[in-house]
Interface confidence: low
Amino acid sequence: DPVLCFTQYEESSGKCKGLLGGGVSVEDCCLNTAFAYQKRSGGLCQPCRSPRWSLWSTWAPCSVTCSEGSQLRYRRCVGWNGQCSGKVAPGTLEWQLQACEDQQCCPEMGGWSGWGPWEPCSVTCSKGTRTRRRACNHPAPKCGGHCPGQAQESEACDTQQVCPTHGAWATWGPWTPCSASCHGGPHEPKETRSRKCSAPEPSQKPPGKPCPGLAYEQRRCTGLPPCPVAGGWGPWGPVSPCPVTCGLGQTMEQRTCNHPVPQHGGPFCAGDATRTHICNTAVPCPVDGEWDSWGEWSPCIRRNMKSISCQEIPGQQSRGRTCRGRKFDGHRCAGQQQDIRHCYSIQHCPLKGSWSEWSTWGLCMPPCGPNPTRARQRLCTPLLPKYPPTVSMVEGQGEKNVTFWGRPLPRCEELQGQKLVVEEKRPCLHVPACKDPEEEEL
């Protein structure tokens, strides 16, 4: 017969899980021993594994609720293609029966005693109720039993007394205006309302109770704008480190306007948020060296030659300079301390000369003394020999410029009886007086 085939068998509940499908034979379904089958939907689920006993079911309820009874439980041989221990076929149930007792004895009814006296009326004025009671002890019930009917009964009673009128509050009056126009100030704004003990008033005879509670109440006003809070300075912060490693610097302290922060249109803190101090490292700053001006050129000479004056023989000369003022690990002067150049020596050489044009007029001398004059000159200028302007001293080092050096002896035709300099002098006109400009202002 075809069966419903499932992929899982749940041991704890004995249920089939994971329906694979129907219309297959048990033999085909149980090709996989992990599978399970049902002969019809909702029927007994049998696993495909070899048969074995299921877990025992829980005990059924005791057959009686009081005194001794008995109860059953069962297990089933579940599986396919074989038998359970005891040569039992799959599907067979095995039962167990045991004695049980939910409650040792069965309940027994009790009987009522006679009614007790009536209690006083429930009120001291006007009409109320009164109550009387009886006990379930004639006889007492056994094993959780009870008496039938009620343990107490009530009836109406009349005190023949007029009741006093107790006071009750009339409705609250309107809220008064707020005691302040903003909240957060020194006094919290409040509004107040009052009520009267007049709905009704307490009676005089017999005396009624006054109204409970207070005749007025207060509450915080809502919807008010916050009061402005003026800002206050916090403490000065730490002094910043001196920003320089030598000489004087400036350190700073800062404070914040947050003690409190200005709020709701309150003014900002008055005064400065920062203050500065001079800090003294007491360490002098480095002073960089500076070159002095170049010294005089040394005489133009050539090694191993006594003199090269007045000859077309290039020589060399040098000049030096001093690096001054370097202190406290300042930078040394950049560049060369010595300057070397190539030269032709025309020191004391007799050279043909020619007269220059007139120079421009010089300054008036003396500037503040009597009768100042100015002068101009014509000079006997030497005509330099046409030696090569560049030379190649060492092969492969290229051409080097050659400079004429020395004071030659120029020879010119006499001019106005002079051989070297002709000077013309003129008086300076309309000379102003020399006055201290500072004194002039006074």
Epitope: P284, G325, F328
Partner: nanobody, 129 residues
Amino acid sequence: QVHLVESGGGLVQAGGSLRLSCAASGRTFSSYAMGWFRQPPGKEREFVAAITWSGSSIYYADSVKGRFTISRDNAKNTVYLQMNSLKPEDTAVYYCAAEETSKYSGSYYYMMGDSYDYWGQGTQVTVSG
């Protein structure tokens, strides 16, 4: 350029006095700050006293305060160190130094040998116990 020559050193008993002089060549003596330094045997050179170009500021090492006095005479191009109440620990070679007046000032500056541009050869002072 300034050339400095110290004089006045010698041997003296503890508690005695000496006056050291330092003569400077050059016309611009009055524009230099002057200092006295000393080098005890086997120790490093240390500051003794200094005087600014005008004489308006004078600085002393703590060890000589109240006993030594520095002064200058710009007309004679000379700086002096008057040493009283001498102690054996004052034994040293005493050097005179000149500093071209700079933009720096303050005791720390004048107490540093590096601050000075020109130095004398030194004069020996020995104080016996």
